[in-house]
Interface confidence: low
């Protein structure tokens, strides 16, 4: 083996005999034929050595200590490395020790990476043998903060004046990272702060400093608990002792956000608070002890985090402070009223003002809770306006139409999320580009996704519904002439899982005169069904829509109309359809109120289908359904 320590490393390595075992044969460290039972390597030294036995891990342990001086110069903050790397060390039980000395005014924070730490008490050990021992300092006195295993909730420990951190790794453990970093903080004005983060349900057992011995006299120690919003925390004291106080009183103080009586002070013998919503702090405050008969203050307690027993205790924060022109309404789903008694279902603002429905507006954070036996009785509708007032500023600007993640945190199903897209009249138009190509919902090929986009005109005088579209089709973009509303409507709770498939980008583009243009790139595997807007009610009077249909170079598109005739009867004007080859610009014009629709026809190149309506007689509307299929091109007919 070779261990080389850089001169400036402030690292010392010590190999020494471990706990004596009743092994018959002794073992030695061999350095240049000389046998020894202890080896110390200091900065700047490079030592070559071997062991005289096959299993040195049964005899020796190795300690690697790094002294970090924050008194005389800058402190090397950041992720703490295992130096030397474990791969360069002999396979012995090893303890890495970091001894950090700092001014009283400087706070030091140990940050532990996931899986975080779990404190254990006397007589316990860690399943994998990896342990952390953490100590602090009060003047010259060392104070044990605790010993910890992996897989817990302790994410950070803040101290001041100094930290001694020991990481014990068994010889067989492959670990090559320390799992923590050091950061500097302002003075914490107490012995230490331990942060415990819960990701979900679970419990943590924690102990006062020096446990099971006595907590330092007149000291203050704080635990900060980070609890997910939907869970509740309860504290119970497993074991405690009180010292004999001369002045002041030993107590625990809770800082509970939202409480009007912070800090809430409890005696150790009191019943401790339970069912707490949100993050909270717990502090242990010692007293001035009787010099003759001090006794000891010690505390071992458990924090249990679990789902609340009923929904009414949960507080949800809906942060609309960064949203503009947005309103969120939580309201009852429409259901058939039964004659039976139905318990009330209310949504509450700030836990106090409760009603059957609630509208939250953008610009602020809202705290809400529910008093409801079954939250599936409610749903949520959101409206957001995206408007452009200055066409010079908006042109080519894009917005992402996505449901904000905050909304998924609420326990109520999203029904509709509507974006109203408003443009200056006759100045700009809109284009919708989906993250995944869209399919138009038709009777022949219905959407079977957990959500769809409903696209409709948002001009009050205009009754124009472009259709319902879901991911997984062939429509690459939808261009619309003027104001529209795009509504993401959910149909199943699985929308939360499928939410990653949502995503539309809207861009403001130069104004064009057609009511809508659909850009379609058919899939070689399936029929693309397309139908005119306002299906079943008829395309509005004098409205023109187009489909830009791309045909891949090696394919032939077959365009088929559902009926022989449209059935439209024009009161004034003419209804016509133009089919135009994009490459040659050759076009055919069909009179929809007179001619039969064309028979299935083949297109070797991309083409346009444009439909323009007349003013139809009532009841004789223009509705057109067609489909496009692709087949491989066998003979090039061009």
């Amino acid at each position: 083996f070779e261990i080389a320590l850089p001169r400036e490393s402030n690292i010392t390595v010590l190999i020494k005999l471990g706990t004596p075992t009743l092994l018959a044969k002794p073992c030695y460290i061999v350095i240049s034929k000389r046998h020894t039972t202890m080896l110390s390597i200091k900065p700047g030294e490079r030592i070559l050595f071997t062991f005289s036995c096959q299993s040195p891990e049964n005899h020796f342990v190795i300690e690697i200590q790094k002294n970090i001086d924050c008194m005389s110069g800058p402190c090397p903050f950041g992720e703490v490395q295992l130096q030397p790397s474990t791969s360069l060390l002999p396979t012995l039980n090893r303890t890495f020790i970091w001894d950090v000395k700092a001014h009283k005014s400087i706070g030091l924070e140990l940050q532990f990476s996931i899986p975080r730490l779990r404190q254990f008490g006397p007589g316990e050990s860690c399943p994998d043998g990896v342990t952390y021992s953490i100590s602090g300092r009060i003047d010259a006195t060392v104070v044990r903060i605790g010993t910890f295993c992996s897989n817990g909730t302790v994410s950070r420990i803040k101290m001041q004046e100094g930290v001694k951190m020991a990481l014990h790794l068994p010889w067989f453990h492959p670990r090559n990272v320390s799992g923590f970093s050091i950061a500097n903080r302002s003075s914490i004005k107490r012995l230490c702060i331990i942060e415990s983060v819960f990701e979900g349900e679970g419990s943590a057992t924690l102990m006062s400093a020096n446990y099971p011995e006595g907590f330092p006299e007149d000291e203050l120690m704080t635990w900060q608990f980070v609890i997910p919003a939907h869970l509740r925390a309860s504290v119970s004291f497993l074991n405690f002792n009180l010292s004999n106080c001369e002045r002041k009183e030993e107590r625990v103080e809770y800082y509970i956000p939202g409480s009007t009586t912070n800090p809430e002070v409890f005696k150790l013998e009191d019943k401790q608070p339970g069912n707490m919503a949100g993050n909270f702090n717990l502090s242990l405050q010692g007293c001035d002890q009787d010099a003759q008969n001090p006794g000891i203050l010690r505390l071992q307690f458990q924090v249990l985090v679990q789902h609340p027993q009923n929904e009414s205790n949960k507080i949800y924060v809906v942060d609309l402070s960064n949203e503009r022109a947005t309103s969120l309404t939580i309201e009852p789903r429409p259901v058939k009223q039964s004659r039976k008694f139905v318990p009330g279902c209310f949504v509450c603002l700030e836990s106090r003002t409760c009603s059957t429905n609630l509208t939250l507006t953008s610009g602020s954070k809202h705290k809400i809770s529910f008093l409801c036996d079954n939250l599936t009785r409610l749903w949520m509708n959101v409206e957001k306006n995206i408007s452009c007032t200055d066409h010079r500023y908006c042109q080519r600007k894009s917005y992402s139409l996505q449901v904000p993640s905050d909304i998924f945190h609420l326990p109520v199903e999203l029904h509709d999320f509507s974006w109203k897209l408003l443009v200056p009249k006759d100045r700009l138009s809109l284009v919708l580009v989906p993250a995944q190509k869209l399919q138009q919902h038709t009777h022949e090929k219905p959407c079977n996704t957990s959500f769809s986009y409903l696209v409709a005109s948002a001009i009050p005088s205009q009754d124009l519904y472009f259709g319902s579209f879901c991911p997984g089709g062939s429509i690459e973009q939808i261009q619309v002439k003027q104001n529209i509303s795009v509504t993401l409507r959910t149909f199943a709770p699985s929308f939360r899982q499928e939410a990653s498939r949502q995503g539309l980008t809207v861009s403001f583009i130069p104004y064009f005169k057609e009511e809508g243009v659909f850009t379609v790139t058919p899939d070689t595997k399936s029929k693309v069904y397309l139908r005119t807007p306002n299906w079943d009610r008829g395309l509005p009077s004098l409205t023109s829509v187009s489909w830009n249909i791309s045909v891949p170079r090696d394919q032939v598109a077959c365009l088929t109309f559902f009926k022989e005739r449209t059935g439209v009867v024009c009161q004034t004007g003419r209804a016509f359809m133009i089919i135009q080859e994009q490459r040659t610009r050759a076009e055919e014009i069909f009179s929809l109120d007179e001619d039969a629709l064309p028979k299935p026809r083949f297109h070797h190149h991309s083409f346009w289908v444009n439909i323009s309506n007349c003013s139809p007689a009532s009841g004789k509307q223009l509705d057109l359904l067609f489909w496009v299929t692709l087949t491989p091109r066998t003979v090039d007919l061009t």
Partner: antibody, heavy 120, light 112 residues
Framework: EVQLVESGGGLVQPGGSLRLSCAAS????????MSWVRQAPGKGLEWVAN????????DYVDSVKGRFTISRDNAKNSLYLQMNSLRVEDTAVYYC?????????????WGQGTLVTVSS | DIVMTQSPLSLPVTPGEPASISCRSS???????????LDWYLQKPGQSPQLLIY???NRASGVPDRFSGSGSGTDFTLKISRVEAEDVGVYYC?????????FGQGTKLEIK
């Protein structure tokens, strides 16, 4: 048909500058993030920089930060890479790539590349 | 940055035989969405790279079904069920989870 065509490569001395261009066609350019990826002669691929649809967000590999600038002109369907303070180790074929697909970073279309040689 | 490691670096294969390339990442590429953010690219001689597989196991359009991707977390495999002469080139894996995206060193597939 999606097409990306790079240009602007050539021989330049260390410390010099070049501006690469990428002309895009066959897709809605303004709807996609775009990237530059390079490949040193006989070596593997290294991502260099990318830019959001509207140009509001840009990111660079550490080795080119402060020296290279990515930009785009959606009206011209063009992507650019301004390379200053060039070093010998910047010698590579530079590819313009479209970031498509649900994983964001997936480069679903690539240009044919343009060779940049930095040599004295 | 996430480090990607491919093996083997060179892979001579007889046409019609299967081939397998391994890729390991220095940290898990499994996203909360359940996808593995790993792509495979092929760079044929004298050509630019082309996307073969995205999100670990999804074939890009136009990619023959003899190509398949598998694996999860940190270990991934690209398999070619029956190698054809046109499959020669350098295969790269790339993590698409974090910026910057990082590529493996490449595996050169050649015909025996």
């Amino acid at each position: 048909e999606v097409q990306l065509v790079e240009s602007g490569g050539g021989l330049v001395q260390p410390g010099g500058s070049l501006r690469l261009s990428c002309a895009a066609s066959g897709f809605t350019f303004s709807s996609y993030w775009m990237s530059w990826v390079r490949q040193a002669p006989g070596k593997g691929l290294e991502w260099v920089a990318n830019i959001k649809q509207d140009g509001s967000e840009k990111d660079y590999v550490d080795s080119v930060k402060g020296r290279f600038t990515i930009s785009r002109d959606n009206a011209k369907n063009s992507l650019y890479l301004q390379m200053n303070s060039l070093r010998v180790e910047d010698t590579a074929v530079y590819y313009c790539a479209r970031e498509g697909g649900s994983s964001g970073w997936t480069f679903d279309y690539w240009g044919q590349g343009t060779l940049v040689t930095v040599s004295s | 940055d996430i480090v990607m490691t491919q093996s083997p670096l060179s892979l001579p294969v007889t046409p019609g035989e299967p081939a397998s390339i391994s890729c390991r990442s220095s940290q898990s590429l499994l996203h909360s969405s359940g996808h593995n953010f790993l792509d495979w690219y092929l760079q044929k001689p004298g050509q630019s790279p082309q996307l073969l597989i995205y999100l670990g196991s999804n074939r890009a359009s136009g990619v023959p079904d003899r190509f398949s991707g598998s694996g999860s977390g940190t270990d991934f495999t690209l398999k070619i069920s029956r190698v054809e002469a046109e499959d020669v080139g350098v295969y790269y894996c790339m993590q698409a989870l974090q910026t910057p995206p990082t590529f493996g060193q490449g595996t050169k597939l050649e015909i025996k």
